[in-house]
C-alpha cells in the first residue's frame, strides 16, 4: 500500500510509537507531582521558622515588660 | 482505502487521538500556574519572616542603645 | 486521494497542526524561565533573612561576651 | 505516490520531525531536574536558618534560666 | 500568524520618560511572558526586560529602577515606561514573545540626545 | 553576569560551501541558547533553540549543536539567501545575554 513506501509516515511510527502523548501528560503531571512535594516541605521548614521566630519575638518581649 | 490496512495509522490514531497537543499545552500552564501559586505563598511566608526579624532586630538594636 | 478520505489523518491535521511540538518544548522551556526565576527571588529573599539571622547573632554573641 | 501530494502528511513531516516526544520527555525532565536543584539549594539555605535560630532561642533560653 | 507591533519610539532628551506599547496578535497572549529586547546603533542586542504571563517583572541592573515592564492581557498589549532616559539607551527597541525571545516585532526607535 | 563570545565577528564564504559560526558562552548554560538572523533593516529571526532544535519554518540545512559552553551554528551548504548577521543569545541564567554577532556575506 502507498504507506509502506512512506518515509514520512515510517517516521512518524519511529518517533511517536514509544512515548505516546498520554505518557508525556502522565510525565508532566509527574514532574508537577515531585516538584509540589518539595515546595510543600519547603513550605513546612518556613512553618517551623516561624514558629521559632515567634517563640524568639515572645521572649524578647516578655523581658522588656519585666 | 489504503487507510484501513495500515497499522501505522491506526497507531497514529490510538496514540494521539485522545490526548491532542492542545491538551498537553494546557496541562504544562496548568502545571505552571500551580507550582507558580505555591511558590508565591512561600514568597509571603519569607515576608512575613522578614518582617518578623526586622522586628527582632529592632527590639535587640533599641536595647544596645538604652 | 485516499488521503482526502481519511478521518485519521483529517484527525491528525486537526490536532497537531496548531501546536506544533516545537511549541509545545518552547513552552516547557518557558515554564522552567518563569518558575527559575521565582526560585531565584526566594533565594534573594533567603539571603537576606541569612544576613537578618547573623547580625542577631552578633548582637547577641557580643552582649554574652560584654 | 499520494503522499508526495498530500500538504497534511507534507505539515506532519514539517512540524514533528525535527522533535520526537522522547526529545519532548527529555525537556520535561531535564528542567524538573533543574527546578529540583534549585529547590535543593533553597532547603539547604531553610537548614542553615533553622540551626541559626536554634542557636538564637538557646542563647536567649540559657540567658532566661541564667 | 504571531505579529508583533512596537509603537511610542522617538526623540527624547536626557533625563527624559517615553512609553512604548506593544500589540499582539495571532496567539494567546495571556499564555505566553514577553520581552523586550533593543539593538544599539552599533549593532549590539541587549535584553531590556521581561514580564511573566501573571505580571512578575525582571530586569537588567542597568535599566533596573528606571525602566517598567507591564502588561494588558484583555488588549494584548504589552508596554515599556521608560524613565531616566540617558544617551546610552538610544536604540531600536523590539518587543518579543516569551523569555526566549522566539518571535521579534517589527521595532520602534529610541533616539536619547540633547 | 554570563558572557557570549561570537567567533568569527565577519566571513565570506562561496555558495555550497559549508559554514560554521561558534558561541561560547563563560559559563555551563546547560544547551539554553538560541541562534538568531538578521537581514539588513530587519528584526532578527529564530534560527534555533534550545541549542538543536530547529524553529518552525527553518530550512533543515541549518544545525544547532554543542553542550555546556561551547555551542555552534552550521549552514551546510551556503545560499545566497544566507547572507546576513547571526547572534546568539544565551537565556540560561538572567540577564539573558546575546553574542557580538558574525556578519556572514558572500565570495
Known amino acids: 500500500s502507498p504507506q509502506d513506501r512512506s518515509p514520512i509516515l515510517a517516521e512518524v511510527k519511529h518517533s511517536f510509537y514509544p512515548i505516546p502523548e498520554q505518557t508525556l501528560q502522565a510525565t508532566v503531571l509527574e514532574v508537577r507531582h515531585e516538584l509540589k512535594e518539595d515546595i510543600k516541605a519547603l513550605n513546612a521548614k518556613m512553618t517551623n521558622i516561624e514558629k521559632q521566630l515567634s517563640e524568639i519575638l515572645r521572649i524578647l518581649t516578655s523581658r522588656r515588660s519585666s | 482505502s489504503p487507510q484501513d490496512r495500515s497499522p501505522i495509522l491506526a497507531e497514529v490514531k490510538h496514540s494521539f487521538y485522545p490526548i491532542p497537543e492542545q491538551t498537553l499545552q494546557a496541562t504544562v500552564l496548568e502545571v505552571r500556574h500551580e507550582l507558580k501559586e505555591d511558590i508565591k505563598a512561600l514568597n509571603a511566608k519569607m515576608t512575613n519572616i522578614e518582617k518578623q526579624l526586622s522586628e527582632i532586630l529592632r527590639i535587640l538594636t533599641s536595647r544596645r542603645s538604652s | 486521494s485516499p488521503q482526502d478520505r481519511s478521518p485519521i489523518l483529517a484527525e491528525v491535521k486537526h490536532s497537531f497542526y496548531p501546536i506544533p511540538e516545537q511549541t509545545l518544548q518552547a513552552t516547557v522551556l518557558e515554564v522552567r524561565h518563569e518558575l527559575k526565576e521565582d526560585i531565584k527571588a526566594l533565594n534573594a529573599k533567603m539571603t537576606n533573612i541569612e544576613k537578618q539571622l547573623s547580625e542577631i547573632l552578633r548582637i547577641l554573641t557580643s552582649r554574652r561576651s560584654s | 505516490s499520494p503522499q508526495d501530494r498530500s500538504p497534511i502528511l507534507a505539515e506532519v513531516k514539517h512540524s514533528f520531525y525535527p522533535i520526537p516526544e522522547q526529545t519532548l520527555q527529555a525537556t520535561v525532565l531535564e528542567v524538573r531536574h533543574e527546578l529540583k536543584e534549585d529547590i535543593k539549594a533553597l532547603n539547604a539555605k531553610m537548614t542553615n536558618i533553622e540551626k541559626q535560630l536554634s542557636e538564637i532561642l538557646r542563647i536567649l533560653t540559657s540567658r532566661r534560666s541564667s | 500568524e504571531v505579529k508583533l507591533v512596537e509603537s511610542g519610539g522617538g526623540l527624547v532628551k536626557p533625563g527624559g520618560s517615553l512609553k512604548l506599547s506593544c500589540a499582539a496578535s495571532?496567539?494567546?497572549?495571556?499564555?505566553?511572558?514577553m520581552s523586550w529586547v533593543r539593538q544599539t546603533p552599533e549593532k549590539r542586542l541587549e535584553w531590556v526586560a521581561s514580564i511573566s504571563s501573571d505580571g512578575d517583572t525582571y530586569f537588567p541592573d542597568n535599566v533596573k529602577g528606571r525602566f517598567t515592564i507591564s502588561r494588558e492581557n484583555a488588549g494584548n498589549i504589552l508596554f515599556l515606561q521608560m524613565s531616566s532616559l540617558r544617551s546610552e539607551d538610544t536604540a531600536m527597541y523590539y518587543c518579543?514573545?516569551?523569555?526566549?525571545?522566539?518571535?521579534w516585532g517589527q521595532g520602534t526607535l529610541v533616539t536619547v540626545s540633547a | 553576569d554570563i558572557k557570549m563570545t561570537q567567533s568569527p565577528s565577519s566571513m565570506y564564504a562561496s555558495l555550497g560551501e559549508r559554514v560554521t559560526i561558534t558561541c561560547k558562552a563563560s559559563q555551563d548554560i546547560k544547551s539554553y541558547l538560541s541562534w538568531y538572523q538578521q537581514k539588513p533593516w530587519k528584526s532578527p529571526k529564530i534560527l534555533i533553540y534550545?541549542?538543536?532544535s530547529l524553529a518552525d519554518g527553518v530550512p533543515s540545512r541549518i544545525s544547532g549543536s554543542g553542550s555546556g559552553q561551547d555551542y555552534s551554528l552550521t549552514i551546510s551548504s551556503l545560499e545566497s539567501d544566507d547572507t546576513a548577521t547571526y547572534y546568539c543569545?544565551?537565556?540560561?541564567?538572567?540577564?539573558?545575554?546575546f553574542g557580538g554577532g558574525t556578519k556572514l556575506e558572500i565570495k
Open positions: 534550545y541549542a538543536t
Open positions: 543569545l544565551q537565556h540560561g541564567e538572567s540577564p539573558y545575554t
Open positions: 518579543a514573545r516569551g523569555f526566549m525571545i522566539t518571535f
Open positions: 495571532g496567539f494567546t497572549f495571556s499564555n505566553y511572558a
